[in-house]
């Protein structure tokens, strides 16, 4: 059965959180997509959604978010870019299907953000993150307004006895590091 | 340590079908994305696609997207990638691989690889 | 897609040589950019990551530099076990795409 899981990632101010979503795109390749923080006890808030009928492989950017749908490959890319202590958080990508519910993917995203030199933006070499060159043309999307109550989460658990780090073959540099915490089976 | 075992070679007729296993051992199958790579004799790399082992999803290149299925059994860690509609120019070297980075990250570096199957295509 | 050119596709060296394979790609792909060795009947090795960055148990004398469009490799001193091919691939976007290799032969 799939597990929905966490991935923490815990990366640097100014840096690049760059991440996939992956979808059944043979349902949903030109489905709204969408990219939401999660607060405890709190609605998700949407921060930015592809077009609706989602684009093949076209930028989208709000803000410093963007989000770049592979239908080829039933693919959601999620860049957040110049990173801030304060985007920390719980992050998923949803589907958007009116008039039905949104559909969560999987995984979902821990965003840590440190305070911590990372000198100008992409000339830090220890960074597995890289930092993305904004396209000269993005396209804003308009949100739907509505999510779901059932994508509410819990806090997740407090206990580090369900938390696996990564093979140690992996090396991931220190400034960077990804930890998956089931929340569910 | 990670390890990728692949199924022996096979030796196939044009327009019939291949499918070749993929066990993983040594991490936790549903954590990594799978990915397959061809290579034809004395020729480049190419990729071909990947598969979510968590969520069963996979995508492929166009080129090979009416002929390939990628499906995994994660009872027993292990991925599967079938060829259908074989033709002479399929004739290549498959490897499994497993990229660098968990499932979510957009981090396609291709960190342990499978010691590869070879598929005959010849009539 | 985006196209990457290796040069040169075949080059012959002596053990001790400091050697430089260059990848370029067909736009800007940031530092989205790997290396891998392969020797013949063997599934390629990752050497680099993200253009710079040395892959655990690669020996120093492998580097990894550049961004944007130009890519180089470098072996810093030639050892008999460096000769086989070696590939650029990048993953800016989908698909990812492979350069078509430098053979490293001994002179």
């Known amino acids: 059965a799939t597990k929905l899981t966490e991935e923490k990632y815990e990366l640097k101010e100014g840096q690049t959180l760059d991440v996939k979503c992956d979808y059944t795109l043979e349902k949903f390749a030109s489905s709204q997509k969408a990219w939401q923080i999660i607060r405890d006890g709190e609605m998700p808030k949407t921060l930015a959604c592809t077009e609706r009928p989602s684009k093949n492989s076209h930028p989208v950017q709000v803000g410093r978010i963007i989000l770049e749908d592979y239908h080829d490959h039933g693919l959601l890319r999620v860049r957040m870019v110049n990173l801030q202590v304060e985007d920390s958080g719980l992050y998923q990508c949803v589907i958007y299907q009116p008039p039905k519910e949104p559909h969560m993917l999987f995984d979902r995203i821990r965003l840590v953000v440190t305070k911590g030199f990372s000198g100008t933006p992409g000339s830090n070499e220890n960074s597995t993150q890289n930092v993305y060159k904004i396209p000269p043309t993005t396209t804003k999307a308009l949100c739907p307004l509505y999510t779901s109550p059932r994508t509410v989460t819990q806090a997740p658990p407090k206990s580090t006895a369900d938390v696996s780090t990564p093979d140690s073959e992996i090396n991931l540099t220190n400034v960077t590091d990804i930890i998956r915490v089931p929340v569910f089976n | 340590q990670v390890q990728l075992v692949q199924s022996g070679a096979e030796v196939k007729k044009p327009g019939a079908s291949v499918k070749v296993s993929c066990k993983a051992s040594?991490?936790?199958?549903?954590?990594?994305?799978i990915n397959w790579v061809r290579q034809a004799t004395g020729q480049g790399l190419e990729w071909m696609g990947w598969?979510?082992?968590?969520?069963?999803?996979?995508g492929s290149v166009k080129k090979f997207r009416d002929r390939v299925t990628m499906t995994r059994d994660t009872s027993i860690s292990t991925a599967y990638m079938e060829l259908s509609s074989l033709r002479s120019e399929d004739t290549a070297v498959y490897y499994c691989?497993?990229?660098?980075?968990?499932?979510?990250?957009?981090?396609?570096?291709?960190?342990?690889w499978g010691q590869g199957t070879l598929v005959t295509v010849s009539s | 897609d985006i196209q990457m050119t290796q040069s040169p596709s075949s080059l012959s060296a002596s053990v001790g040589d400091r050697v430089t394979i260059t990848c370029q790609a067909s736009?800007?792909?940031?530092?989205?950019l790997n290396w891998y060795q392969q020797k013949p009947g063997k599934a390629p090795k990752l050497l680099i990551y993200?253009?710079?960055n040395l892959e655990t148990g690669v020996p120093s004398r492998f580097s990894g530099s550049g961004s944007g469009t130009d890519f180089t490799f470098t072996i810093s001193s030639l050892q008999p076990e460096d000769f086989a091919t070696y590939y650029c691939?990048?993953?800016?976007?989908?698909?990812?795409?492979f350069g078509q290799g430098t053979r490293l032969e001994i002179k």
């Open positions: 691989v497993r990229l660098i980075g968990y499932s979510s990250a957009f981090k396609w570096s291709f960190q342990h």
């Open positions: 040594g991490y936790t199958f549903t954590s990594y994305d």
């Open positions: 598969m979510n082992p968590n969520s069963g999803n996979s």
């Open positions: 736009r800007d792909i940031s530092k989205y």
């Open positions: 993200d253009a710079s």
């Open positions: 691939q990048h993953y800016d976007n989908i698909p990812i795409t």
